[in-house]
């Protein structure tokens, strides 16, 4: 339910802003307002404290994995949630902080030589000769490169703008972190009023283009706060 | 240039079965997320299913869950549909589009007729 | 269930500013602020015309362009042209349906 998510770790633990890895401030998004939880058929604003949605592990922050917030909860519905600390109960190694992995259906620490040889094997073995769903750990390890080898194009699946091909950035889209155009003049924008805001939001527009700054449109001074429209402005 | 081809449409009995194909090229299919839409005679669009780059998560509408499977081959650069125990309400144009930003690019789509 | 709202048609005469509007709930575009639109000729697949409310992918004439006030969304083409005269659908979301699509607005160019 929404008050167990609320009352969840996932909380203390938000996600990244979108765009730069955990501990990267510089994020090269711009969230669009309203901070939106995806439950049941509606969304619900809940003091601007939201679950991240996620479809897959690696659209977390490092320190967090995909799941469902309820036991066999709906699969249309999953947040990052924190990770697990060393002894608690895993299913995959995605679930475990980093240091660790899971061993057993627990979190243990990992002695890294022993370690990296398991990671190594692992996605060997899973890019053979076809292209198999690397699970967890393994799977985050090998996106970077494998995945993206050549820059990823508009609306290819990213982890971080680096990603992406020039003019390009790396923001959440619903459903998984994408590669979209940098913003052009006049293109709307979004200011962040408070900081650390942009990395809870469904859909991400990007940071406006060189020499353009995210300013209010002149003639919207008028309007309420909250409704106000920003636009990409020349300096 | 980004190309997406359906096959595998026809006409088929209620309660028949048939599978879907989209054959995928001009861009790197395993980058993206792809989805099916279909459209009845006359009617609007209906979103039906998508998929994950991996193909490790799906969703589906609630008229198709259960009865519809995506799935996908990314050694052949391939999106599948499975569709069992179909319905006449099921009859449509069915595409296939890659989840770009949005639905970025459309096949030209195959049509599934449901009747006796 | 979300639903969206469209006229079910639209007509002008070419080079004419025409605008299609598409009314949801603040659940959906209200809520969301993001919405798309397609076209789609009669026999031919869709294609993306806008995407975040108001940005047109590369390739499409700039003749077209997007809005949002409140809870409507609206897709306006101006300097109307034969080859405009098509099916119209706004596209927004829902949390587990993904996609949800408007029922279509036919646009006839006259003359």
């Known amino acids: 339910t929404l008050n167990s998510v609320l009352n969840s770790n996932a909380i203390k633990n938000l996600p990244p802003p979108l765009g730069g890895a955990a501990g990267h401030p510089g994020s090269a998004v711009s969230a669009a307002p309203g901070i939106l939880y995806p439950g049941g058929n509606k969304y619900q604003t809940i003091d601007n404290y939201q679950p991240y949605p996620c479809a897959e592990d690696e659209e977390c922050g490092t320190d967090e994995y995909c799941a469902s917030p309820t036991r066999g909860g709906d699969a249309g519905v999953q947040i990052c949630l924190a990770c697990r600390k060393r002894r608690k109960r895993c299913m995959r190694h995605a679930m475990c902080c980093p240091g660790n992995y899971c061993k057993n259906g627990i979190c243990v620490s990992s002695d890294q030589n022993n370690f990296r040889g398991e990671i190594e094997e692992t996605i060997t073995e899973s890019f053979g000769n076809d292209h198999s769903t690397l699970d967890g750990y393994s799977r985050r390890t090998t996106l970077s490169s494998k995945m993206y080898h050549s820059k990823g194009q508009e609306g290819s699946v990213c982890l971080r703008s680096s990603d992406c091909a020039t003019g390009l950035c790396c923001a959440r889209h619903f459903w998984s972190k994408i590669c979209k155009p940098v913003l052009k003049e006049g293109q709307v924008c979004t200011k962040h009023r408070r900081k650390g805001s942009h990395g809870l939001e469904i859909f991400q527009r990007c940071y406006c283009g060189e020499g353009l700054s995210c300013r209010i449109q002149k003639d919207h001074h008028q309007a309420s706060n909250s409704s106000r429209l920003h636009t990409c402005q020349r300096h | 240039q980004v190309q997406l081809v359906e096959s595998g449409g026809g006409l088929v009995q209620p309660g028949g079965s048939l599978r879907l194909s989209c054959a995928a090229s001009g861009f790197t299919f395993s980058s993206y997320w792809m989805s099916w839409v279909r459209q009845a005679p006359g009617k609007g669009l209906e979103w039906v299913s998508g998929i994950s780059y991996s193909g490790s998560n799906t969703h589906y509408a609630d008229s198709v869950k259960g009865r519809f499977t995506i799935s996908r081959d990314n050694s052949k650069n391939t999106l599948y549909l499975q569709m069992n125990s179909l319905r006449a309400e099921d009859t449509a144009v069915y595409y296939c589009?890659?989840?770009?930003?949005?639905?970025?690019?459309w096949g030209q789509g195959t049509l599934v007729t449901v009747s006796s | 269930d979300i639903a969206l709202t469209q006229p079910a048609s639209v007509s002008g005469s070419p080079g004419q500013s025409i605008t299609i509007s598409c009314t949801g709930t603040s659940s959906d575009v209200g809520g969301f602020n993001y919405v798309s639109w397609y076209q789609q000729h009669p026999g031919k697949a869709p294609k993306l015309m806008i995407h975040?409310?108001?940005n047109r992918p590369s390739g499409v004439s700039n003749r077209f362009s997007g809005s949002k006030s409140g809870n409507t969304a609206s897709l306006t083409i101006s300097g109307l042209q034969a080859e405009d005269e098509a099916d119209y659908y706004c596209?927004?979301?829902?949390?587990?349906?993904?996609?949800?699509f408007g029922g279509g607005t036919k646009l006839t160019v006259l003359g």
């Open positions: 589009a890659r989840m770009g930003i949005d639905l970025d690019y």
């Open positions: 975040d409310g108001s």
């Open positions: 596209q927004t979301w829902d949390s587990l349906s993904f996609f949800v």
